[in-house]
Interface confidence: low
């Protein structure tokens, strides 16, 4: 399988963002790379989001995604947005060079995202 | 050694209050137990408070401390409060039994402590 | 060290509510999940359901409309209850204690580490 | 859900032999499976987690290969308390299932 790397832990912000890098060891010249994002909590698996694109282009994630993201090279830098503490689990980054032939697959593993929800601001009188 | 067990990892609350449990396997009936947090960042170590009570007694903590604590059977209830992100790092229970003889110290493998700084209050007009 | 002491009726009529309870010692129900099993008379294991140390559960799809998993973390008990017995419910029903082992990359397996010795139950009028 | 074919249902085997028993997963389960042994009357024993993370307290005779979804047990030289039912488990999400067992008989 391809080797994909990922940070073991990260803190969401106070905002409920997290980004995170997930890079993989390409074992050929792939054009197009599927990433998705899998969030396992209490050994349940869900996908979070995912993207197709064209080495060199840009992450294009559905309109009302939570993530975005950039690629560089064989890096791909994501952003999970609108995180709360509930959201706290293990986030596996996916690879899957789809195009050209051969198929390979990679799975990271996983980034623990810490997520604390804020103290709500006092009311202004 | 004894056997002193807690949590791997606890998320401080947007207040900076963290809390965990220290449980030793007691080998013999102590009466006075002796409770101290000591914190592991970047392979330093630091004590950050310390109890001593008697068995069925509340854990005294110095005034000025940040930690306070419960105790029940061989369980400590801990928490420290104060927190910010520049704390986070690994919190470690130490249990020494120290009446009656013979004397049992456990250390546990700690607690890492993860604190975010709250995003400040929009200022009120 | 850590038991599992599993216990209810031998013998439920059909239709009726299979009740068991799984009575702990040696951890902490505030650190584990637990799982229930069952093993009908010469066949393999089936796996009924979770609870999380946080509460939440997670049952086999068969069985989910008729399955409750709780726990008193007070009396160290967890309980199962099966409703509207059938002969095909008639098993040795064990709990196990449920382990996330985690290694430097935060990456969790589980595995079911302690099991209680199991309880027969049959479904006969 | 996924399914665990195990191989074989049962085998026939003497002291000091070197046992091999497989586990098939319907889909990569990433080395989430644990392998337990049932003794007649007893409750499982958990012996492997990971895939080849033997569990504290087990005889170093028993080891754990495998990825994606195929994995393997191995006893490198059977003693007379290892004559028992052998279950592989996945543990990638709900539900967890089991493998139907292997039962190991002395020849």
């Known amino acids: 399988a391809m080797h994909v790397a990922q940070p073991a832990v990260v803190l969401a912000s106070s905002r409920g963002i997290a980004s995170f890098v997930c890079e993989y060891a390409s074992p050929g010249k792939a054009t197009e790379v599927r990433v998705t994002v899998l969030r396992q909590a209490d050994s349940q698996v869900t996908e979070v989001c995912a993207a197709t694109y064209m080495m060199g282009n840009e992450l294009t994630f559905l309109d009302d995604s939570i993530c975005t993201g950039t690629s560089s090279g064989n890096q791909v830098n994501l952003t999970i947005q609108g995180l709360r503490a509930m959201d706290t689990g293990l986030y596996i980054c996916k690879v899957e060079l789809m195009y050209p032939p051969p198929y390979y697959l990679g799975i990271g593993n996983g980034t623990q995202i810490y997520v604390i929800d804020p103290e709500p601001c006092p009311d202004s009188d | 050694a004894m056997h002193v067990a807690q949590p791997a990892v606890v998320l401080a609350s947007s207040r900076g209050i963290a809390s965990f449990v220290c449980e030793y396997a007691s080998p013999g009936k102590a009466t006075e137990v002796r409770v101290t947090v000591l914190r592991q960042a970047d392979s330093q170590v630091t004590e950050v408070c310390a109890a001593t009570y008697m068995m069925g007694n509340e854990l005294t903590f110095l005034d000025d401390s940040i930690c306070t604590g419960t105790s029940s059977g061989n369980q400590v209830n801990l928490t420290i409060q104060g927190l910010r992100a520049m704390d986070t790092g690994l919190y470690i229970c130490k249990v020494e039994l120290m009446y009656p003889p013979p004397y049992y110290l456990g250390i546990g493998n700690g607690t890492q402590i993860y604190v975010i700084d709250p995003e400040p209050c929009p200022d009120s007009d | 060290q850590v038991q599992l002491q599993e216990s209810g009726p031998g013998l439920v009529k059909p239709s009726e509510t299979l009740s068991l309870t799984c009575t702990v010692s040696?951890?902490?129900?505030?650190?584990?999940?637990l799982s229930w099993i069952r093993q009908p008379p010469g066949k393999g294991l089936e796996w009924i359901g979770y609870?999380?140390?946080?509460?939440?559960?997670n049952f086999h799809p068969s069985l989910k409309s008729r399955v409750t998993i709780s726990k008193d973390t007070s009396k160290n008990q967890f309980s199962l209850k099966l409703s509207s017995v059938t002969a095909a419910d008639t098993a040795v029903y064990y709990c196990?204690?449920?382990?996330?082992?985690?290694?430097?990359?935060?990456?969790?397996?589980?595995?079911?580490?302690?099991w209680g010795q199991g309880t027969s139950v049959t479904v006969s009028s | 859900d996924i399914q665990m074919t195990q191989s074989p249902s049962s085998l026939s085997a003497s002291v000091g032999d070197r046992v091999t028993i497989t586990c098939r997963a319907s889909?990569?389960?990433?080395?989430?499976l644990a392998w337990y042994q049932q003794k007649q009357g007893k409750a499982p024993k958990l012996l492997l987690y990971?895939?080849?993370n033997l569990q504290d307290g087990v005889p170093s005779r028993f080891s754990g290969s495998g990825s994606g979804t195929d994995y393997t047990l191995t006893i490198s030289s059977l003693q007379p308390e290892d004559f028992a039912t052998y279950f592989c488990?996945?543990?990638?999400?709900?539900?967890?299932?089991f493998g139907q067992g292997t039962k190991l008989e002395i020849k």
């Open positions: 040696g951890f902490s129900l505030t650190s584990y999940g």
């Open positions: 990971a895939a080849t």
């Open positions: 488990q996945h543990l990638w999400g709900t539900p967890y299932t």
């Open positions: 196990a204690k449920t382990e996330g082992h985690y290694y430097g990359s935060n990456y969790g397996y589980y595995a079911l580490d302690y």
């Open positions: 609870i999380w140390y946080d509460g939440n559960t």
């Open positions: 889909e990569n389960i990433y080395s989430n």
